[in-house]
Structure formats: C-alpha cells, structure tokens
Amino acid sequence: ILGGREAEAHARPYMASVQVNGEHLCGGVLVAEQWVLSAAHCLEDAADGKVQVLLGAHSLSQPEPSKRLYDVLRAVPHPDSRPDTIDHDLLLLQLSEKATLGPAVRPLPWQRVDRDVEPGTLCDVAGWGIVSHAGRRPDRLQHVLLPVLDRATCNRRTHHDGAITQRMMCAESNRRDSCKGDSGGPLVCGGVLEGVVTSGSRVCGNRKKPGIYTRVASYAAWIDSVLA
C-alpha cells in the first residue's frame, strides 16, 4: 500500500494473508467460513511451495491471540484466468477446516448486484504489500482510501488503453495506491467487498496507471458455484 497508513488492528476481520512457505505472498479476503478469495496470478508465484492462509492477523511476525494459519484443501482459480492477462484474475482457496470465527476473524459480505460503483466513491484497500518504491515490506497491515475512477478515463490511451473490461474497475493511483504484495486483497466500498486487487506487474503510485480491481459482482455465479 503506497501513501497509506497502519490499519486499526483487527478492524478488518476478513483480511487474509496468502502465504507460501511461511512468507506473505498475496492478500486475500474471507468470504465464507471455509473460503478465501484472492487473485489467480498469486498461484503462479507460488510455484511448488506450500500454500497456507493466515487469518486474524495484524502483525505478520508478532504473536497475536487471534492469529491462525490454515492449510489449503483446494485451490480453485477461475477457469478462464490466464498467465498472460489480468482477465478473470480470481482464485478461491478452500481452507482445510472452517475458520474459527470471532471479533478478529469474520467473512465480509460481497457485492452481488452487478452495477458499477459510482466514480469518486471512496473505497478501502488493505494489505501487507510494499509501502515504498524501494520495496519496503510492512509487518503490520496497512490501508488506504482510494476514489473509484470511471472506466472511460481508465481506458484512455494514456492510461490502460482499452484493457479494462466491464468485469474490472479502477481506482485512482495518484501517490496513493495498492502495490506488489497487495494483490488478491479486498477493495471495500461502503462496507461491502466490491473488488479484488489484480496481480499484474503494474507500476504503482502513477496517476496515469490506475489500480485495477476485479469486480466480484461480475463473478457471483462462479463464486456461488464453487462455494456450493
């Protein structure tokens, strides 16, 4: 997260850290007792390592009573996701068991109505991704409020040049932005999950390259079918 600040501890009980061999790789969001939503590209970076999900965390390193690491029973990337595009960049991870819910671990309601968020709406993004262009990684969860950007502006030739489909949304990236390591994390508007940070190798914090988020409402049927 660039241009953000430390999040209130455990105020985002839906927040997950997708880890490989004990190291934070991507963000994720608890959408059901046994399911975490993240980005499909995160799996590519996992290679053959052991994928686990950390829930109930604020600090990645310090002991916290609510923290628990779960093994992954099943990883379900969206069937149309491809390594060379950011289309359909969603991944569902089934935990080895139902998460123990409490004040610091709770699923987040996700948007089912397939309607664009109004431009200018301030949405919350959180993650343990890098906090500087030098690549500094935070130990504690960071967050930032970002305004939603209209698709037409995002698709300008000077911006993402038509790459943003109806199934994606954009947010401003003028010095405040999501960045490497935040992929798979939640974009929360009005207390509801609207988007998931895509995991392309986009430059961060440049206003001409807005943040790209996969619109969860556009994938309601797929999410429901996997969770069923």
Epitope: G3, R5, E6, A7, E8, A11, R12, P109, V113, V117, E118, P119, G120, T121, L122, D124, A126, H143, L145, P147, V148, E172, N174, R175, R176, V188, C189, G190, G191, V192, R207
Partner: antibody, heavy 121, light 106 residues
C-alpha cells in the same frame, strides 16, 4: 486534540465569490481526505465534495460542480472552498469535515466550527 | 443518488421513555451512520456503521437495520438528548444525508 478551525462569517453580494478556509490541527493533514458540507436554512445537510490534501485529487457532488472549488495548502494544513456566482440559494453554513480514523467504516468523525455565508445586496 | 427519508420529522417524548426514529433509503445500502446536532453547534458523529456508538455516546443509544431501513433507538430518554439526528449513507457517491428528526423533550 483534533480540530478544524474555520474562517469567520461572510456577507457577500449576489454574483460575487467567496473563499472560506479550514485549518486542521492535532493530526497529519495530508493523511486524510477533507470533505465539505452545506447546511441550508431548513437545516438540510448536503455533501459538496472532498479533496485529498496529499495529492489534490478531488470529487464533487454533481449539484455543486461549477459552484464550489476545493483546494489545499499543505504548508499551513489548510483547506479552502471557493464559491462563485453567489445567489441567495448559497446562503448557508458551510462545514469542513474529515475522518481521521483507520477502520474501514469511515465517517465524518471531526467537524469544523462552520462558516456562515450570507448573500445579500 | 441515494435519497434518505427520515421519520418522524419531529418527535416529542418524555424523559424515561423509549424512542425510535427511522431512516429509509431509496435503494439498498449496507450500513448507515448517524449524527447528532444541537442548535448553534456542528454535527457530532453519533452512531457509525449502523450499530457502533461513536466515542462518548451513552449506551442508552443503539442503532440497527439493513437494506433500505435503519433506525436509531434511545432506551430511556434524557433531557440532554434533545437535538436533531441525521442519518447518512456512505455506500455511494454522492454521500447523502437524511432530512433529520428533531427530538423534543416534553
């Protein structure tokens, strides 16, 4: 203590412009969005828009586009709102407001002292 | 834009009574905020995200609701509760307020 101190009352003529200020103290000014709200005589609250003091990004309620312009001066931790082409409809109390918390459920948790603008010939 | 309608516009009750005011949205919102304002003062945050009391708010206040219908309840009214209460949605730009419920003490 977090405070938003606004400039004093203004009596302006129809057609003129006015610029009101909001000085923030007790927190890091550039960390948080600054919003502006109009309260007209029927005590109706209308959100005007916001500005991000960190990067100047702003968003306006369509109703106030062309009427209000938001700006900031980082060096003095002050936000400004300019209202132009004033009419009697613009007579109201104007508040700056911010959220300086870090939960995902943001709301207007600090309000300015309010600036009364009266438009009269 | 999302329109918020508050009822009643004016509520008159006696100390010790339980009172409830409502806020209806023209389309579904996930959470609602409430503010208290007394004459000559700026609004104060009162209840955020539907049911969480802002700092310093007495526990006799509570908030509830979902979808298009939300309410603020005072379990035992006190004289100091006389004020106007506004609901506000933050689901979508432009952020909108209700017209307010003015609470008067008999």
């Amino acid at each position: 203590e977090v405070q938003l101190q606004q400039s004093g009352p203004e009596l302006v003529k129809p057609g003129a412009s006015v610029k009101i200020s909001c000085k923030a103290s007790g927190y890091s000014f550039t960390d948080y969005y600054m919003h502006w709200v109009k309260q007209s005589h029927g005590n109706i609250l209308d959100w005007i828009g916001y500005i991000d003091p960190y990067n100047g990004v702003s968003s306006y309620n369509q109703k106030f586009k062309g009427k209000a312009t938001l700006s900031v001066d980082q060096s003095s931790s002050t936000a400004y709102m300019e209202l132009r082409s004033l009419t009697s409809e613009d007579s109201a109390v104007y508040y700056c407001s911010s959220y300086y918390g870090s939960s995902p459920y943001w709301y207007f948790d600090v309000w300015g002292t309010g600036t009364r603008v009266t438009v009269s010939s | 834009q999302i329109v918020l309608s508050q009822s009643p516009a004016i509520l008159s009750a006696s100390p010790g009574e339980k009172v409830t005011m409502t806020c209806r949205a023209s389309s579904s919102v996930s959470y609602m905020h409430w503010y208290q304002q007394k004459p000559g003062s700026s609004p104060k945050p009162w209840i955020y995200a539907t049911s969480n009391l802002a700092s310093g708010v007495p526990t006799r206040f509570s908030g509830s609701g979902s979808g298009t219908s939300y309410s603020l309840t005072i379990s035992k009214l006190e004289a100091e509760d006389a004020a106007t209460y506004y609901c506000q949605q933050w689901s979508s730009n432009p952020y909108t307020f209700g017209g307010g419920t003015k609470l008067e003490i008999k």
